[in-house]
């Protein structure tokens, strides 16, 4: 029990997408403030978010400092102006976070088609490679440095004039794809993390067609 | 435990329609890609059609364009097989299986079929 | 679409053979191959993905490889479960296509 007016938070949700991450909660303060901690399993407790009104924390410059590892984190309720009361028990009350594990659980975020050229009847598809905060030797990593092989696109892609959608997948950030000559096509990428058994996919990028800016056509 | 689970088989009139369900357990449909395919009696596997239900993408073989439609009630998760101007050669087990979206996407996991006669 | 042309139709084997499935892509599918085994009135079973992994579960004495455009399926040491039909399957470009099957019976 804490103390008086001072409710524990509850409702304790991560939001991450691409490593970006945020550790969201309940209720909206009324007279308290919250205090966030963060920790790996073996870590010490890192406070973030001192004395905060708000109901979310940026927990994302803790957790890419190593995304394979599994954190916890906790948020404190303290009465608003008397933050150095405790609870009963002498300590702040405080409510855990589910475990969360970056690597098998941030969400894959939208992706976008960079550019794609026509050869002849073949078109070289190419995605986007997202930059994440995921950093190393003080240079911000992209989604596919960070995921590897572990990371694959698949492309939907089908004729202007037709709705069957063809696929092709790859586990570079380009697609070599055989097309009809004279036809134009549209494409849609998805990102997939084959090995995870949740959070698996993206949302479909923006559906880019031939004829249109973002393409290159060259008769051979 | 991931099961996928076909029902609505049974016999039919030439010209005449069914709907397949394909019902899956033990895994979200929208994390994957579901594809029908078929047996005919005493043949081999044939490819009927795909459908990503997280976007409702679809494609589908030749033998059943226009006539087959693959959607999906994420809701449910459940996938379907509406089948209409149904030919004696639709006779077939029909299997709906997952595909786990990798390089080489098998198909790991399988129905246990439902049998559709195409018949007079 | 691409064919895959799957031989022999059917064999003969004992238990405790060596068998050998071999399939044949009409184009580059690189390794975008699976192998099923399917016994009457089942479902297929995966076995090997990717041209050359075992899937899990599966028993070690099934293997597959790769040489170009032809794809192999081994099994080293026939048990008597393995008497089954067993298919190749491709899944580089849509639509995925299925070889023939192979059936292996009991001599």
């Known amino acids: 029990s804490g103390t008086t007016n001072t409710v524990a938070a509850y409702n304790l949700t991560w939001k991450s997408t691409n490593f970006k991450t945020i550790l969201e909660w309940e209720p909206k303060p009324v007279n308290q403030v919250y205090t966030v901690q963060i920790s790996t399993k073996s870590g010490d407790w890192k406070s973030k978010c001192f004395y905060t009104t708000d109901t979310e924390c940026d927990l994302t410059d803790e957790i890419v400092k190593d995304v394979k590892q599994t954190y916890l984190a906790r948020v404190f309720s303290y009465p608003a102006g008397n933050v150095e009361s405790t609870g009963s028990a002498g300590e702040p009350l405080y409510e855990n976070s589910p475990e969360f594990t970056p690597y098998l659980e941030t969400n894959l975020g939208q992706p976008t088609i960079q550019s794609f050229e026509q050869v002849g009847t073949k078109v070289n598809v190419t995605v986007e490679d997202e930059r994440t905060l995921v950093r190393r030797n003080n240079t911000f990593l992209s989604l596919r440095d960070v995921f590897g092989k572990d990371l694959i696109y698949t492309l939907y892609y089908w004729k202007s004039s037709s709705s069957g959608k063809k696929t092709a997948k790859t586990n570079t950030n380009e697609f070599l794809i055989d097309v009809d000559k004279g036809e134009n096509y549209c494409f849609s990428v998805q990102a997939v993390i084959p090995s995870r058994t949740v959070n698996r996919k993206s949302t479909d990028s923006p559906v880019e067609c031939m004829g249109q800016e973002k393409g290159e056509f060259r008769e051979i | 435990e991931v099961q996928l689970v076909e029902s609505g088989g049974g016999l039919v009139q030439p010209g005449g329609s069914l709907r397949l369900s394909c019902a899956a357990s033990?895994?979200?449909?929208?994390?994957?890609?579901i594809h029908w395919v078929r047996q005919a009696p005493g043949k081999g596997l044939e490819w009927v059609g795909y459908?990503?239900?997280?976007?409702?993408?679809?494609y589908y073989a030749d033998s059943v364009k226009g006539r087959f439609t693959i959607s999906a009630d994420t809701s449910k998760n459940t996938a379907y097989l509406q089948m209409n101007s149904l030919r004696a050669e639709d006779t077939a087990v029909y299997y709906c299986?997952?595909?786990?979206?990798?390089?080489?996407?098998?198909?790991?996991?399988w129905g246990q079929g439902t049998l559709v006669t195409v018949s007079s | 679409d691409i064919q895959m042309t799957q031989s022999p139709s059917s064999l003969s084997a004992s238990v405790g053979d060596r068998v050998t499935i071999t399939c044949r892509a009409s184009?580059?599918?690189?390794?975008?191959v699976a192998w099923y085994q399917q016994k009457p009135g089942k479902a297929p079973k995966l076995l090997i993905y990717?041209?050359?992994f075992l899937y899990s579960g599966v028993p070690s004495r099934f293997s597959g490889s790769r040489s170009g455009t032809d794809f192999t399926l081994t099994i080293s040491s026939l048990q008597p479960e393995d008497f089954a039909t067993y298919y190749c399957?491709?899944?580089?470009?849509?639509?995925?296509?299925f070889g023939q099957g192979t059936k292996v019976e009991i001599k």
């Open positions: 990717s041209a050359s």
């Open positions: 459908i990503d239900p997280s976007n409702g993408y679809t």
């Open positions: 033990g895994f979200t449909i929208s994390d994957y890609i």
């Open positions: 299986a997952r595909d786990d979206q990798s390089l080489s996407s098998p198909f790991d996991y």
């Open positions: 184009q580059d599918v690189n390794t975008a």
């Open positions: 399957q491709q899944h580089y470009t849509t639509p995925p296509t």
